[in-house]
Interface confidence: low
């Protein structure tokens, strides 16, 4: 029977800069029941606080609700593992909420084949930003990426859409069924998961000729 091994805070993520969650990996348990606590202070403060919510994020997590989240402060946090034989501490982790944002996937993905008489046909893709993100404040710039492929193909074709919420694709294989997905990331954060796939059948008369 031994003191617990050193835990590690391995990930912190925020969906929208208003709340965030951190997760840790326990070290070895030393063969005894082990309790974990996460403590933190915000830069500029000496006051140490304990994690406000160990439940919402699941096992080995700490969730910071709105009233505990400030995007203007760096959080300095550590996890303490304790059993009957002693304690061990994780390394301190510095967290800027601004830089850990991982939004939900974009919503309302719509895909349509457009065949204007006087121009080349194209695939028109449109979507909306995730609901939790408030773009009006100017605190967020969301960037978008689209991927698509014929249903039976192995390789995805990827297009960067910048800040646009619609995109046109010209070169497609007639008669194929395509899967289309979109994802987003804030300027300093992480890519969201891909949105659920939308399927579109490209007509056989979809011509790529001039």
């Amino acid at each position: 029977q031994l003191p617990p091994g050193k835990p590690e805070i391995f990930k912190c993520r925020s969906p929208n800069k208003e709340t965030f969650t951190c997760w840790w990996r326990p070290g070895t348990d030393g063969g005894l029941p082990t309790n974990y606590s996460l403590t933190y202070h915000r830069e500029g403060e000496t006051l140490m606080h304990e994690c406000p919510d160990y439940i919402t994020g699941g096992p080995n997590s700490c969730h910071f609700g709105k009233q505990y989240t400030s995007m203007w402060r760096t959080y300095i946090m550590m996890v303490n593992a304790t059993n009957q034989m002693g304690s061990s501490f994780s390394d301190e982790l510095y967290v800027d909420v601004t830089y850990i944002v991982q939004p939900d996937p974009p919503l309302e993905l719509a895909v349509e084949v457009k065949q204007p008489e006087d121009r080349k046909p194209y695939l028109w893709i449109k979507w909306s930003p995730p609901t939790l993100i408030d773009l009006k404040t100017g605190w967020f710039t969301l960037l978008y990426e689209i991927r698509l492929k014929p249903e039976k193909a192995a390789e995805w074709e990827i297009h960067f859409a910048g800040q646009q919420t619609e995109f046109k694709i010209l070169s497609l294989h007639p008669g194929q069924k395509y899967l289309v997905q979109v994802r987003c990331k804030p300027d300093h954060g992480y890519w969201s998961a891909w949105s659920p796939a939308t399927f579109i059948q490209i007509p056989s008369d979809f011509t790529m000729n001039d």
Epitope: E43, G44, E45, T46, L47, M71, W72, T74, I76, Y94, D96, T98, Y99, D187, H188
Partner: antibody, heavy 118, light 112 residues
């Protein structure tokens, strides 16, 4: 070792502009908040501005808001302060400083003197 | 007017004596839980950090320098003054309502 080397000060007329630079070395520049602090001749220290690590967030003292702009180039390890619409009361030694956790300003540049006079 | 007020403004002390410098803030800075840092500035030089986070000494700072904080007040103590300690000392803290740093007006420490 940590070094902050400043440049860009000088004599300027009221209403004029200057750009101060602070070249950082000896540490991982993009890991730190950075600050500007000034000191008028014979007076105390006055905080001017700070900027977060990846630079979207900035704070300014009320006395310089709308006239001064802090920025940074993490690729060049350099901090800047653009001074516009300068006034006589902006005459001071300007120091750049590195921030750490709890934003302590633990390393300071040697200072660069800005004199606003006609 | 939000400020950090240092007292005394100047003090003259003999080598080997103990000196304390007080820094009084308000509920938006020191009293809000924000830490206090102390800087020493000698003529013609940039300030140097002597105490950070209320009572922590950076490496290389002699242990005669100590700091404490209670409520809206902070104190710098030099337990046995040396000639090289003659300088101006400043306290500093973050202020929430200004969203910026505040410095005290400085305390000039002279050797008798």
């Amino acid at each position: 070792q940590v070094q902050l080397v400043q440049s860009g000060g000088g004599l300027v007329q009221p209403g004029g502009s200057l750009r101060l630079s602070c070249a950082a070395s000896g540490f991982s520049y993009s890991d730190y908040w950075m600050h500007w602090v000034r000191q008028a001749p014979g007076k105390g220290l006055e905080w001017v501005s700070d900027i977060s690590r990846l630079s979207p967030y900035t704070n300014y003292a009320d006395s310089v808001k709308g006239r001064f702009t802090i920025s940074r180039d993490n690729a060049k390890n350099t901090l800047y302060l653009q001074l516009n619409s300068l006034r006589a009361e902006d005459t001071a030694m300007y120091y750049c400083a590195r921030g750490l956790d709890a934003r302590r300003m633990s390393y300071w540049g040697q200072g660069t003197l800005v004199t606003v006079s006609s | 007017d939000i400020q950090l007020t240092q007292s005394p403004s100047s003090v003259s002390v003999s080598v080997g004596e103990r000196v304390t410098i007080d820094c009084t803030g308000s509920s938006s800075n020191i009293g809000h839980g924000y830490v206090v840092h102390w800087y020493q500035q000698k003529p013609g030089q940039a300030p140097q950090l002597k105490i950070y986070r209320n009572n922590q000494r950076p490496s290389g700072v002699p242990d005669r320098f100590s700091g404490s904080k209670s409520g809206t007040d902070a104190t710098l103590t030099i337990s046995s003054l040396q000639a090289e300690d003659a300088a101006v000392y400043y306290c500093a803290a973050w202020d929430d309502s200004l969203n910026g740093w505040l410095f005290g007006q400085g305390t000039k420490l002279e050797i008798k």
